[in-house]
């Protein structure tokens, strides 16, 4: 028969022969022969290969370096890499999560729209009219101004985006 020029999925062409690729979690140690299938070996401890392959070396699992604020979110297997995330209060600087930075705080006049996660930073928004934030915080939303009316008080000092209104007693009408 004519030697193949192309092979099926999960095969590779070598020496005019179609050999099976190694399954995920295993590496190539010898091509197939006319008598035998491809020889593959399991990846070692702390190694992985996540595809059908003809790699001769497995990849090292990612190291979640605590000095960079990283911790293991999901332990790697022979078929998957380790997934890192950041310690509490920190988030990844990139999709690959190779290092972490402290969550941003929202300055006075801004509130937290979305609290940060291990992979995304804090999202701040300016406090709209009627709301304020007088602290720098990674958690606090804009608070509504105090309603003086509901306390039977009047506004003595108007609120801003950084300060609450100041309420005071109503002036008594003199007879």
């Amino acid at each position: 028969p004519e030697p193949p020029t192309a092979c099926r999925e999960k095969q590779y062409l070598i020496n005019s022969q179609c050999c099976s690729l190694c399954q995920p979690g295993q590496k190539l140690v010898s091509d197939c022969t006319e008598f035998t299938e491809t020889e593959c070996l399991p990846c070692g401890e702390s190694e992985f290969l996540d595809t059908w392959n003809r790699e001769t070396h497995c990849h090292q699992h990612k190291y979640c370096d605590p000095n960079l604020g990283l911790r293991v979110q999901q332990k790697g297997t022979s078929e998957t890499d380790t997934i890192c995330t950041c310690e509490e209060g920190w988030h990844c600087t990139s999709e690959a999560c190779e290092s972490c930075v402290l969550h941003r705080s929202c300055s006075p006049g801004f509130g937290v729209k979305q609290i940060a996660t291990g992979v995304s930073d804090t999202i701040c928004e300016p406090c709209p009219v009627g709301f304020f934030s007088n602290v720098s915080s990674a958690f606090e939303k804009c608070h509504p101004w105090t309603s003086c009316e509901t306390k039977d008080l009047v506004v003595q000092q108007a609120g801003t985006n950084k300060t609450d209104v100041v309420c005071g007693p109503q002036d008594r009408l003199r007879a």
Partner: antibody, heavy 113, light 111 residues
């Protein structure tokens, strides 16, 4: 056609270093491991060692320090550093890592004073 | 070091009979199945029959059958023929630091 052929076997005196060569054709050593196996006259098969795709060698515990396996793009060498009479045997190279699918015909080494 | 013990040796069988050869490893073979069987006739190199404990090498007659896992393996030859007279070797692969090892061989005599 895939084939292997050993060469370099001869009569040597004890202590004289000897290198055997396995010449391969029809396949690539960059994606195949190779083994060396020997057989003393009238005795069984004895695994000496292998060389991996990456070029790192592994040896039987009794063979460490006595034998060295290396390779080029088309040959695999077995060096016997200081042969003794117990090393008299037919030496085979075989393709594979744990499965020795293709064997050469062998080359005879005789160690005698 | 690993030891592969083959039993019995020698073994004889009539034409058409069945031969069973056992191979015991002193430790688990790689992935529990890295064991091969070879046939060798005088003046010839070994020929691969079975690999990964039970896979038949291409071109080998189906009367040869391998089985087993871990440390205990068996080669069975059913319907023995005159041409099967030879010495049979088991060979195991172990984790990377330990390499490979052969059993002592079993001579099969066909009557």
């Amino acid at each position: 056609c895939q084939s292997l052929e050993e060469s370099g076997g001869r009569l040597v005196t004890p202590g004289t270093p000897l290198t055997l060569t396995c010449t391969v054709s029809g396949f690539d050593l960059s994606s195949n491991a190779m083994n060396w196996v020997r057989q003393a006259p009238g005795k069984g098969l004895e695994w000496i060692g292998y060389i991996t795709i990456s070029g790192s060698a592994g040896y039987a515990s009794w063979a460490k320090g006595r034998f060295t396996i290396s390779k080029t793009s088309t040959t695999v060498d077995l060096k016997i550093s200081s042969p003794t009479t117990e090393d008299t045997a037919t030496y085979f190279c075989a393709r594979g890592y744990n499965t020795m699918a293709i064997w050469g015909p062998g080359t005879l080494v005789t160690v005698s004073s | 070091a690993q030891v592969l013990t083959q039993t019995p040796s020698p073994v004889s069988a009539p034409v058409g009979g069945t031969v069973t050869i056992n191979c015991q490893s002193s430790q688990n073979v790689l992935i529990n199945n890295r064991l091969a069987w070879y046939q060798q006739k005088p003046g010839q190199p070994p020929k691969l029959l079975i690999y990964d404990a039970s896979k038949l090498a291409s071109g080998v007659p189906s009367r040869f059958k391998g089985s087993g896992s871990g440390t205990q393996f068996t080669l069975t030859i059913s319907g023995v023929q005159c041409d099967d007279a030879a010495t049979y070797y088991c060979q195991a692969g172990y984790s990377s630091g330990d390499g490979n090892a052969f059993g002592g061989g079993t001579e099969v005599v066909v009557k």
